[in-house]
């Protein structure tokens, strides 16, 4: 049914999320999400994950720097809104972005291991 | 925000249950009443997997398990004996149960702790 998420996924506001408890590199995380017909988290706004705003973990999200566009892009090619992470100008463009659902974001080496969040839109 | 599915708006769905993820702190009894007013129950834990999931969401929350005193057994809201281990049970002042990062422990029922509500689909 179009309103249901896969088993072990969280449904919230018409989206399904897989919240990993295992740690992976950014690339491993991206492939794991793709294998589940989803993509690494693309945030619409910082309260998108407010159901887990008490979490004190960081999670890989689907943001990477494009040399070609000289911009931070989501996996679908759309640009990062400058209002989402006010500190994004200080991010090292060689790094990937780890996000805490409280609204904090860090740039870390893509080879580092973090938990990750996959997202699927229901409709 | 759009709304889909079988759970109340702003609740989450997980494994055929709906969860209200509270951000406000309440005593155990206040939490019980708050969940009742939402036509649901104070959080119950059915298995290890659910406990792990909820621990990712929030570091601690009340669960619907209590005892009348340290001489009484731990029971669920429907009066059944609660089988799982609850830490610090030897302390006579701690008669309500809390989920705290992958383990269950006793706490003072009058403490202000975050609460979550649940109802099964």
């Amino acid at each position: 049914d179009c309103c249901s998420c896969q088993e072990k996924w969280v449904g919230y506001r018409c989206n399904c999320y897989f919240i990993s408890s295992e740690q992976k590199t950014w690339n491993e995380s991206r492939h794991l999400c793709a294998s589940q017909k989803s993509s690494l988290l693309q945030l619409q706004n910082t309260d998108e994950l407010d159901f887990m705003s008490s979490s004190q973990q960081f999670y890989w999200i689907g943001l990477s720097y494009s040399e070609e566009h000289t911009a931070w892009l989501w996996e679908n090619g759309s640009a990062l809104s400058q209002y989402l992470f006010p500190s994004f100008e200080t991010f090292n463009t060689k790094n990937c972005i780890a996000y805490n659902p409280n609204g904090n974001a860090l740039d870390e080496s893509c080879e580092d291991k973090n938990r990750y969040i996959c997202k699927q839109q229901l409709i | 925000a759009r709304h889909c599915g079988h759970c109340p708006e702003e609740w989450i769905t997980y494994s055929n249950s709906c969860y209200y993820i509270g951000k406000e702190r309440r005593t155990w009894e206040e939490s019980l009443l708050a969940c009742t007013s939402k036509n649901s129950s104070l959080l119950s834990i059915d298995n290890e997997e659910e406990m792990k999931f909820l621990s990712i969401i929030s570091p601690s929350s009340w669960i619907g398990v209590f005892r009348n005193s340290s001489h009484h057994p731990w029971v669920t809201m429907n009066g059944l004996a609660f089988k799982h281990e609850i830490k610090d049970s030897d302390n006579a002042e701690l008669n309500c149960a809390v989920l705290q990062v992958n383990r269950l422990k006793s706490a003072q029922c009058g403490s202000s702790i975050i609460y979550h509500c649940k109802h099964k689909l």
Epitope: Q23, T25, S54, Q56, Q57, F58, N95, N100, N102, N104, E108, S109, E111, D112, K113, N114 | S55, P59, S60, V101, I113
Partner: antibody
Framework: QVQLVESGGGLVKPGGSLRLSCAAS????????MRWIRQAPGKGLEWVSH????????YYADSVKGRFTISRDNAKNSLYLQMNSLRAEDTAVYYC?????????????WGQGTLVTVSS | DIQMTQSPSSVSASVGDRVTITCRAS??????LAWYQQKPGKAPKLLIY???SLQSGVPSRFSGSGSGTDFTLTISSLQPEDFATYYC?????????FGQGTKLEIK
Amino acid sequence: QVQLVESGGGLVKPGGSLRLSCAASGFTFSDYYMRWIRQAPGKGLEWVSHISTSGSTIYYADSVKGRFTISRDNAKNSLYLQMNSLRAEDTAVYYCARDHYYSRGVIGYWGQGTLVTVSS
Amino acid sequence: DIQMTQSPSSVSASVGDRVTITCRASQGISSWLAWYQQKPGKAPKLLIYAASSLQSGVPSRFSGSGSGTDFTLTISSLQPEDFATYYCQQANSFPYTFGQGTKLEIK
């Protein structure tokens, strides 16, 4: 169970060097940020440095920047701190520390500490 | 940098007393706060994380509360082994910082 054992401390003259090591066991070392924290005699706790899981993301306190180098060997479950151009104010007990599994930046486990004394 | 200020810097109390130590952050840190206990010659030990969550193995007489900028550590009934120095620490943003410590002494 989790164990962190530091070694390499000792007495050194100002301007000298020391290399601290920390042997980790009882957990998947490559899954955790690792930290060095120090405590001067009779004083409080001070963050010195930390290193990410792969060793690529590193932080140093301003007081040690350019003089200390943190590194890790995930194959050997070991953390290191190379300390050069040591000063009297670097005298402290140095603790190797591991993050808590739930809260990034909170120290869940500490080593027993190794004393570094910088004196002529 | 976020400054962490503990008060009092020292406190005298007796076995059985209820003791409260406060910690104030110079800016909001949500609930990214930890409390540690340190005894002379020993490494610190984690008591509380996420402002109010009790670390496994820590006695339930220890509790933490607060959010934002103001936090408290409470020991409900002091035991002889609780006389030590207590530190708060923020983990909200780099560089992570500790409070200056509160020494709890026997009256």
